[in-house]
């Protein structure tokens, strides 16, 4: 059987505060627990939800939580159900409301000496206690000829007179708390001798040089006085007008007329009514001078056909607020249809090409009119005038690929080469009409090119293959002067390319045939063993059928390549002594020798007194200093080759001889003795 360990119990609760109805059951098996409110299942919400078996309230609500709660436990195996005791909330609350007129039925019926009853619409539980206030001052029972019942929510004034006039408010409190009236009641009981407003002046906006009229009327017994004042408190009468209000007229009925209004007339006008008794009644109205500023410029707009677009017209600042309308081709746009005006917006629904043109936004008020044009372009998808075509371009010459399209607005054209965007550089140039120029066409320009022509409405593209017509050329051109080493094997290559594979052959420049030890193997001139006689001028001839022949002249020199007879050695010298770096080279033609010291070539003409290069190539440095230390390179070169060798020079301080050392003791390292 199902047993309730804890049952929910009725309890006090505060509106909007937390609460918990406890329920705990004990049963042999699994029990499903749910809650009923007045017999209907309670659905979980963020405000009210089951927490375990209990029902938790995040914020008690006097309307949704009134009624009887019951906890139900069901054993699903047996189907048995058990119900807890009923529980309900005694919810304490208070809610503000307005002060309203209960008697008489309307404010218009309030007359001096009648009974007036006000009702305080603050509700709560438990029943609140009420307190009334006039102009913020508490009222008590029997005070100043009024009956107040604080148990009730009514305030009765009997009889009501001018002295009861004021702002009535109420507050109430109970166990939940306190609340004051959300809206107060102004009671106004007129004294006949007080000035009362019959007609109040209204703010006026006029254009310069136009006229303005303010109406003002008061009533009282006896009739009240009426006076007009301008901002600086200067009275305005027909007899004494201030200098800046010469064109002002006050009529017998209290109206004030201003003619030919100027900017200095703008400001606040006060109409003052004074009865025999009571305070003066001051009414204000402002005279504004109409004005209208300039309108901001529109950026031209580009739209696509079929879309819906809006152009907002920002009205210029102005007084009164300018009215705005749109025109096209001199005709005002309607407020509905396909092209229409909605508020300040120009709306183009399902744009057509014919909608292109100039639209004008007009703004106008009393001060004048302003207008601003917006140019609307309806973009179209480009169409072809000339597509790029597969082309044969000659190597070394400029080549052109055309991509001519037309659309609105003018299309932008971009080119791709092998799917890579072509950025303009010294070799590629895209003209305004879309044509691509390839300056100095190269063999590897032979590939696919694609042009894309676009507008906001869409794009079209086409591609073309470029075939490069190669010129007949040496690849690479042979060096015009070449050296061969005497008595060694040598080869002189010559290769060429063209539209057709060229035939390559060598001949001597004088036309004589090649000796038998010299072979021409597919363009490579081969010397089995170079002799002095092999020197001379040779010509490489490349030829094919369509392109004819080309020639390259090569002067071959036979040389004995350079070798060093003497190479400089690692040298250490005492400071102030002389260093000698020897270098001798041999070869044919006879090599020249140059020295490089501390990473700069030593110019024999600018060596100065301390350095000298001998005829045989040796370098001598007198009076060496520490800064002469470093690597020295001997460079031997002739017209055929160049060789170098290097050695370090160390400059050291001369050691002071120790007494134990004999006069013949050798230095601690190899020295040049000078």
């Amino acid at each position: 059987a199902i047993v309730f360990i804890k049952q929910p119990s009725s309890q006090d609760a505060l509106q909007g505060r937390r609460a918990l109805l406890r329920c705990e059951v004990e049963a042999p098996g699994l029990v499903h627990v749910y809650w009923l409110l007045d017999g209907a299942p309670v659905q979980d919400t963020e405000r009210r939800f089951t927490q375990g078996s209990s029902l938790s309230f995040a914020a008690v609500d006097r309307l949704q939580d009134s009624g009887t709660f019951q906890c139900v436990a069901r054993d699903d195996v047996t189907g048995e159900e058990a119900r807890s005791a009923n529980a309900s909330f005694n919810i304490k609350w208070i809610e503000a409301g307005p002060v309203v007129l209960k008697h008489p039925a309307s404010e218009a019926e309030i007359q001096p000496q009648t009974q007036v009853t006000l009702r305080c619409h603050i509700d709560g539980h438990p029943r609140p206690t009420y307190q009334w206030f006039r102009d913020g001052t508490p009222l008590s029972d029997g005070q100043s000829n009024n009956t107040v019942s604080s148990k009730e929510r009514n305030l009765t004034l009997r009889p009501a007179g001018p002295e009861h006039s004021g702002l009535y408010s109420c507050c109430a409190h109970n166990a939940f708390g306190q609340a004051c009236s959300s809206q107060n009641f102004t009671l106004s009981i007129a004294d006949e001798s007080f000035a009362r407003v019959v007609l109040a002046p209204q703010d006026v906006i006029v254009a310069r040089n136009e006229e303005a009229m303010f109406h003002c009327q008061f009533s009282a017994q006896p009739p009240p006085n009426l006076q007009w004042l301008f901002e600086d408190e200067t009275p305005i009468t027909n007899r004494s007008r201030p200098p800046h209000l010469r064109r002002a007229t006050v009529f017998a009925n209290g109206s004030l007329l201003l003619t030919q209004v100027r900017p200095r007339n703008a400001g606040v006008y006060r109409c003052i009514g004074q009865g025999q008794r009571g305070p003066p009644v001051i009414l204000e109205a402002t005279l504004h001078l109409a004005e209208i500023e300039d309108m901001p410029l529109f950026e031209p707009r580009v739209f696509t056909a079929g879309s819906e677009e809006r152009v907002t017209c920002l009205p210029p600042k102005g007084l009164p607020e300018p009215s705005v309308w749109w025109e096209h081709a001199g005709v005002r746009l309607p407020t509905h249809g396909r092209v229409y005006q909605k508020g300040h917006e120009l709306v183009l629904a399902s744009i057509a090409e014919s909608d292109a043109g100039v639209y004008t936004c007009h703004a106008a008020n009393l001060a004048g009119q302003r207008r601003q044009d917006v140019n609307i372009t309806v973009a179209t998808v480009p169409t072809w005038l000339k597509k790029p075509q597969d082309s044969q371009l000659e190597e070394g010459k400029p080549g052109y690929l055309h991509c001519l399209t037309q659309a609105t607005p003018k299309p932008t054209v971009v080119w791709y080469r092998n799917q890579m965007l072509i950025s303009e550089d010294s070799r590629f140039e895209v003209f305004k009409n879309g044509t691509l120029r390839i300056n100095n066409v190269e063999v590897y320009d032979g590939t696919w090119y694609r042009c894309v022509s676009s507008t906001p409405a869409g794009s079209i593209e086409a591609q073309a293959r470029v075939q490069v017509l190669e010129k007949l050329k040496f690849t690479p051109p042979p060096q015009p002067q070449q050296c061969m080493e005497f008595d060694k094997e040598a080869t002189v290559p010559c290769s060429a390319t063209g539209r057709e594979k060229p035939t390559i052959k060598w001949e001597r420049a004088d036309g004589s045939s090649l000796p038998e030890w010299v072979t021409d193997n597919a363009g490579t001139l081969h010397f089995a063993r170079v002799t002095r006689d092999d020197a001379g001028n040779y010509t490489c001839i490349a030829s094919n059928g369509p392109q004819g022949q080309i020639r390259a002249h090569v002067q071959l020199t036979v040389a004995v390549f350079i070798t060093f007879k003497v190479e400089p050695e690692r040298t250490t010298v005492y400071q102030g002594h002389t260093a000698l770096l020897q270098c001798e080279a041999q070869g044919d033609p006879k090599p020249l020798i140059q020295w490089k010291g501390k990473d700069r070539i030593l110019d024999p003409t600018k060596l100065g007194p301390r350095m000298h290069i001998f005829q045989n190539g040796s370098l001598v440095i007198h009076d060496v200093a520490p800064e002469d230390s470093g690597r020295y390179t001997c460079i031997a070169g002739n017209s055929c080759n160049i060789k170098h060798t290097e050695a370090p020079l160390y400059v050291v301080d001369k050691p002071v001889p120790e007494e134990s050392e004999g006069p013949g003791s050798p230095p601690p390292y190899k020295m040049i003795q000078t």
């Epitope: 098996g29 699994l30 499903h32 009923l36 017999g39 209907a40 299942p41 139900v72 069901r74 054993d75 699903d76 195996v77 047996t78 189907g79 048995e80 159900e81 058990a82 119900r83």
Partner: antibody, heavy 113, light 107 residues
């Protein structure tokens, strides 16, 4: 002993409603929840919902909300289930059960035009 | 909703044998799984609830085990009257959900 007697088989046209009953005997009817289940070839057994006869409060399987309406008549110890806007997919055997331990013999509903 | 997968859907065995039927839940249902026997012309019979609790009047050759997501019904020493349709059902939360059933037939 506990017995649940269900109403007889129904053959109905598509679009109409049918109301089947389940009379409980041998126990205090209002002290036990009554479950309704559907058995079809396509979906095996499906739980439709449970009604508490004491107050008549119900818990439905979301899937059957709007399709099934469960009610009770305490005076006759009878539970009812009405099936609305019938389609061929509603053809099945419908069971009532007091908890998991006691089942009715089932009511066959066939929807056919 | 909790999905229940029952296996096998068909099982053939001989009297005296021991058989097992498995049920797997798509999420943990603690121990709350029940087993039913269904025979033509008879009302459905609750065999086991809360995973392993034997319903009164059910022979002890029926036993249940498992918790969380994996459960087993074991029938030891099969009797001729045990050949029927068997269903598992989770009763951890509403809506109750059932396995697809296992038909136990004589080999």
């Amino acid at each position: 002993q506990v017995q649940l007697q269900q109403s007889g088989a129904e053959l109905v046209r598509p679009g109409v409603s049918v109301k089947i009953s389940c009379k409980g005997s041998g126990y205090t009817f209002t002290d036990y929840g009554m479950h309704w289940l559907k058995q079809s070839h396509a979906k095996s057994l499906e739980w439709i919902g449970v009604i508490s006869p004491y107050y008549g409060d119900v818990t439905y399987n979301q899937k059957f909300k709007g399709k099934a309406t469960m009610t009770v008549d305490k005076s006759s110890s009878t539970a009812y289930m009405e099936l609305a806007r019938l389609t061929s997919e509603d053809s099945a055997i419908y069971y009532c059960a007091r908890g998991m331990g006691y089942w009715g013999q089932g009511t066959s509903v066939t929807v056919s035009s | 909703d909790v999905q229940i997968t029952q296996s096998p859907s068909y099982l053939a065995a001989s009297p005296g044998e021991t058989i097992t039927i498995n049920c797997r839940a798509s999420q943990s249902i603690s121990k709350y799984l029940a087993w039913y026997q269904e025979k033509p012309g008879k009302t459905n019979k609750l065999l086991i609830y809360s995973g392993s609790t034997l319903q009164s009047g059910i022979p002890s050759r029926f036993s249940g085990s498992g918790s969380g997501t994996d459960f087993t019904l074991t029938i030891s020493s099969l009797e001729p009257e045990d050949f029927a349709m068997y269903y598992c059902q989770q009763h951890n939360e509403y809506p109750w959900t059932f396995g697809g059933g296992t038909k136990l037939e004589i080999k």
